[in-house]
Interface confidence: low
């Protein structure tokens, strides 16, 4: 807490300008009017204040707006935003995408801080859903943003917003998240033709069910091994050797290098060895010829 001391004669600030960088902390506290500061916040960011001085300016704004800053001030916080705590930010009502962008710009290049996470949370809750413009903005600043959301939060993403998602935005998503995003993507891209559709849907296929993979295998899509390895194991297991061959096209040869890894390993165990042999890749571990394959999942469903 800065002590309340009278402003020395002639030092009362008429405007927020560079002369203030020569003020000691107590002089800033005593000589800068909080209302003046609030109306000239856009200048603060362009003045070489020390961060001790910025602490004083923040303190003045906190006193002026104990219930939380108005958006007109928030939009111009600039580097003062880095001084805010999540508790401060929870008091804000940020509705403008421009304000959000301005504050994310300040934090650009940093990891997502607790302050930024709180700001985004406040903004999205205020909007009620993750619309396309918001998602566009957030993924531009934080490619991993989408995958930081819970499946429940992702359920509020409208299919139209999926157009804003880039492949790298999904890199860290787990299967539970892709399970939520895939149906939305399928809906968003449903009117595209075969090859264009596959390019768009490819990143989301970690959430695709078996029947969709079977359908894709009929479309000469030539799925690469990296995408195949991210598919749900339970969705891959029912695929026949012929379907996998059609799905992967020329990339089928890559199965050999992945034969010890899921889902390839588990899929091999479910295939007849003579079917695997037709691929000519030397894949081993299939069901020997003459053995009966019981579909236990079907048996369980009947009992």
């Amino acid at each position: 807490e800065v002590e309340k001391t009278a402003c020395p004669s002639g030092k009362k600030a008429r405007e927020i300008d560079e002369s203030l960088i020569f003020y000691k902390k107590w002089e800033l506290e005593a000589c800068v009017d909080a209302a003046l500061l609030a109306t000239q916040m856009d200048r603060v960011n362009a003045i070489p204040f020390t961060y001790e001085q910025l602490d004083v300016l923040k303190h003045k704004l906190d006193e002026l707006y104990p219930q939380g800053y108005p958006e007109s001030v928030i939009q111009h916080l600039g580097y003062l935003f880095l001084k805010m705590s999540p508790e401060d930010i929870r008091k804000w009502n940020v509705t403008s995408l421009e304000t959000l962008k301005a504050l994310l710009e300040v934090n650009k290049g940093h990891e997502m801080s607790p302050q930024v996470a709180t700001l985004i949370d406040r903004f999205v809750k205020g909007r009620g859903q993750l619309d396309k413009d918001t998602l566009d903005t957030l993924t531009a600043f934080y490619p991993g943003y989408l995958c930081s959301l819970s499946p429940e939060e992702l359920s509020s993403v409208p299919p139209s917003s999926i157009w804003a998602v880039r492949p790298q935005d999904l890199d860290t998503c787990d299967p539970r998240q892709l399970d939520v995003l895939y149906p939305k993507a399928r809906l968003a891209f449903q009117n595209m033709n075969g090859s264009e559709y596959f390019v768009k849907i490819q990143s989301f296929l970690g959430g695709a069910p078996t029947e969709d993979l079977k359908a894709l295998s009929q479309q000469n899509v030539s799925m690469d091994l990296a995408t195949f390895m991210k598919l749900r194991t339970d969705a891959v297991l029912p695929l026949t050797v012929a379907e996998v061959q059609k799905l992967l096209g020329p990339h089928v040869e890559g199965l050999k290098a992945e034969e010890r890894h899921r889902p390839v390993r588990d899929w091999i165990l479910r295939q007849r060895q003579d079917d695997l042999d037709t691929l000519g890749l030397g894949l081993q571990g299939g069901i020997p010829n003459g053995y009966l394959v019981l579909d236990l999942s079907m048996q369980e469903a009947l009992s």
Epitope: D17, N45, A46, P48, T50, Y51, E52, Y79, L82
Partner: antibody, heavy 119, light 109 residues
Framework: QVQLVQSGAEVKKPGASVKVSCKAS????????INWVRQAPGQGLEWMGI????????LYAQKFQGRVTMTRDTSISTAYMELSSLRSEDTAVYYC????????????WGQGTLVTVSS | DIVLTQPPSVSGAPGQRVTISCSGS????????VSWYQQLPGTAPKLLIY???QRPSGVPDRFSGSKSGTSASLAITGLQSEDEADYYC??????????FGGGTKLTVL
């Protein structure tokens, strides 16, 4: 991309003045302060001062007060540093550097201008 | 004149970890952010670390900064021959404004 391009090397006699230019491109010139930093041969970096290209406001290091003048021409996005009453110990590479908003850091630097003071 | 103190030189073998210290006072490092600059031979300085420990995009995560009280340090792990350069710490001083350390020459053995 952001670039700061400085004028070429200069050789001056003691007592003379030198004016070094720094042309900015790739960003809004008036949006960031410009600093001048010098480096004598085999020595460290020494901050000389800062100018706000919008208003022309300047702040000089005490050591150079009275000898240095920093100006700018916003129409050609160029900052200038003039050092007068040159002496041999002013022989150095002079750099302009863009001040990054909010903290005292210099995120982009010019390539440097060698000023040699010799009789 | 120099208010931030750095060791004149440090050295290390390729792959090793080295640290460069920077000592100041309460009027500079103690109350402001520290940045670090790398100056390769014959070139202009380049921003390496800012706000004590932040890396600009493009700077490898082998470089890291830290600060405690009135001292700061730069750590370089997995030393590479191209890291051979001069390194400067810098901050803002209440009395003299922008300040730099004297610089540390890093030699990769």
């Amino acid at each position: 991309q952001v670039q700061l391009v400085q004028s070429g090397a200069e050789v001056k006699k003691p007592g003379a003045s030198v004016k070094v230019s720094c042309k900015a491109s790739g960003y809004t010139f008036t949006g960031n302060y410009i600093n001048w930093v010098r480096q004598a041969p085999g020595q460290g970096l020494e901050w000389m001062g800062i100018i706000n290209p919008t208003k022309g406001w300047t702040l000089y290091a005490q050591k150079f007060q009275g000898r240095v003048t920093m100006t700018r021409d916003t129409s050609i996005s160029t900052a200038y540093m003039e050092l007068s009453s040159l002496r041999s110990e002013d022989t150095a590479v002079y750099y302009c550097a863009r001040w990054h908003h909010g903290t005292w850091i210099f995120d982009y630097w010019g390539q440097g201008t060698l000023v040699t003071v010799s009789s | 004149d120099i208010v931030l103190t750095q060791p004149p030189s440090v050295s290390g073998a390729p792959g090793q970890r080295v640290t460069i210290s920077c000592s100041g006072s309460s009027s500079n490092i103690g109350s402001n952010y520290v940045s670090w600059y790398q100056q390769l031979p014959g070139t202009a300085p380049k921003l390496l670390i800012y706000n004590d420990n932040q890396r600009p995009s493009g700077v490898p995560d082998r470089f890291s900064g830290s600060k405690s009280g009135t001292s700061a340090s730069l750590a370089i792990t997995g030393l590479q021959s191209e890291d051979e350069a001069d390194y400067y710490c810098s901050t803002y001083d209440r009395r003299t404004f922008s300040v730099f350390g004297g610089g540390t020459k890093l030699t990769v053995l």
